[in-house]
């Protein structure tokens, strides 16, 4: 049986112009299905925004690399996997699609809470 | 349905040069990086390098730095792999794959290349 | 250049067994591990990706652990399409390398 038949995806298509101050950021997903026009970094910041970003962009790989570092300091270890409920709020730069795919994306957390706007937190084995 | 379909097996001798095509549908390939991966007989994966299309940087392996050029036309979403100065020990499958974050969801079918006399 | 080492590089299992492949990383890669499928004379497969993140259409049989520098592909009843051979594969930095992968054959 697929895993998580129902779980919606999100695409990105545009991306930010801005750089985002890292320490606005909590976490990100990177966005790979097919299904979407183009790969993406969805940066997920302390306030529940989500922003696409491009991920060949220098500053985007250094976000996410801090960020992955980050996560591995902070316990509990949490891995966050896109759920069924929307934000009622808009994304900051971009249209962003939920549509039913499994494991269309997965949200690296530096926090140790438990839930997220948008998404069903999963406790990393 | 991205598909990467890559050009027919070669037989090139001690010396010489390859050059491996890619052509990718389903995805615009400046949007992303393509990889070279390769595989000779019984053995595993190895990453050659990659290329990205929007702007024709490369990265590679050092081992294989100065004997493999990686191009792309965006115009026929097509990429390239040539490697120089071939010898026995490159008698192997050659993959084109994308991914942006350095992971590969998407591969070519391989292309097997024979280095002989 | 972060090496990877796989183990066991062969494996005898039945239908039904629980499969434990294990890979470790000469540093740490924060999670950046890929695990593939291979069969024979075809392209690998991408199973899973971020240590634990299954991809589209993947069985949920397959699952993903670890951190730091040692990760684990499990597959919780092998069933006969999975006899293959398995590779893990570190993106965190480039050169991205493999581990030696795992050969899961029939018992």
């Known amino acids: 049986q697929p895993d998580a038949v129902n779980a919606p995806l999100t695409c990105c298509y545009s991306f930010t112009s801005k750089m985002i101050p890292m320490s606005r950021l909590e976490s990100y997903k990177r966005i790979t299905s097919s299904r979407c026009p183009k790969e993406a970094v969805v940066f997920v910041t302390k306030l529940k925004r989500e922003v696409c970003a491009d991920p060949k962009k220098e500053w985007v790989q250094t976000y996410i690399k801090n960020l992955d570092r980050n996560q591995m300091r902070s316990e509990p270890t949490t891995l966050f996997k896109t759920a069924s409920a929307l934000r009622s709020s808009a994304p900051l730069n971009v249209k962003l699609t939920r549509k039913s795919e499994a494991n269309a994306s997965t949200t690296f957390s530096t926090t140790t809470s438990s839930t997220s706007v948008g998404v069903t937190s999963v406790t990393v084995n | 349905q991205v598909q990467l379909v890559q050009s027919g097996a070669e037989v090139k001798k001690p010396g010489s040069s390859v050059k491996v095509s890619c052509k990718a549908s389903?995805?615009?390939?400046?949007?992303?990086?393509m990889h070279w991966v390769r595989q000779a007989p019984g053995q595993g994966l190895e990453w050659m390098g990659r290329i990205d299309p929007a702007n024709g940087n490369t990265k590679f392996d050092p081992k294989f730095q100065g004997r493999v050029t990686i191009t792309a036309d965006t115009s026929t979403s097509t990429a390239y792999m040539e490697l120089s100065s071939l010898r026995s020990e490159d008698t192997a499958v050659y993959y084109c794959?994308?991914?942006?974050?350095?992971?590969?969801?998407?591969w070519g079918q391989g292309t097997t290349v024979t280095v002989s006399s | 250049d972060i090496q990877m080492t796989q183990s066991p590089s062969s494996l005898s299992a039945s239908v039904g067994d629980r499969v434990t492949i294990t890979c470790k990383a000469t540093?740490?890669?924060?999670?950046?591990l890929a695990w593939y499928q291979q069969k024979p004379g075809k392209a690998p497969k991408l199973l899973i990706s971020g240590a634990t993140s299954l991809e589209t259409g993947v069985p949920s049989r397959f699952s993903g652990s670890g951190s730091g520098k040692d990760y684990t592909l499990t597959i919780s009843s092998l069933q006969p399409e999975d006899f293959a051979t398995y590779y893990c594969q570190q993106f965190w930095s480039a050169p991205y390398t493999f581990g030696g992968g795992t050969k899961v054959e029939i018992k």
């Open positions: 389903g995805l615009t390939i400046s949007d992303t990086y």
């Open positions: 540093e740490d890669i924060y999670n950046r």
């Open positions: 794959a994308r991914g942006v974050f350095g992971f590969f969801d998407y």
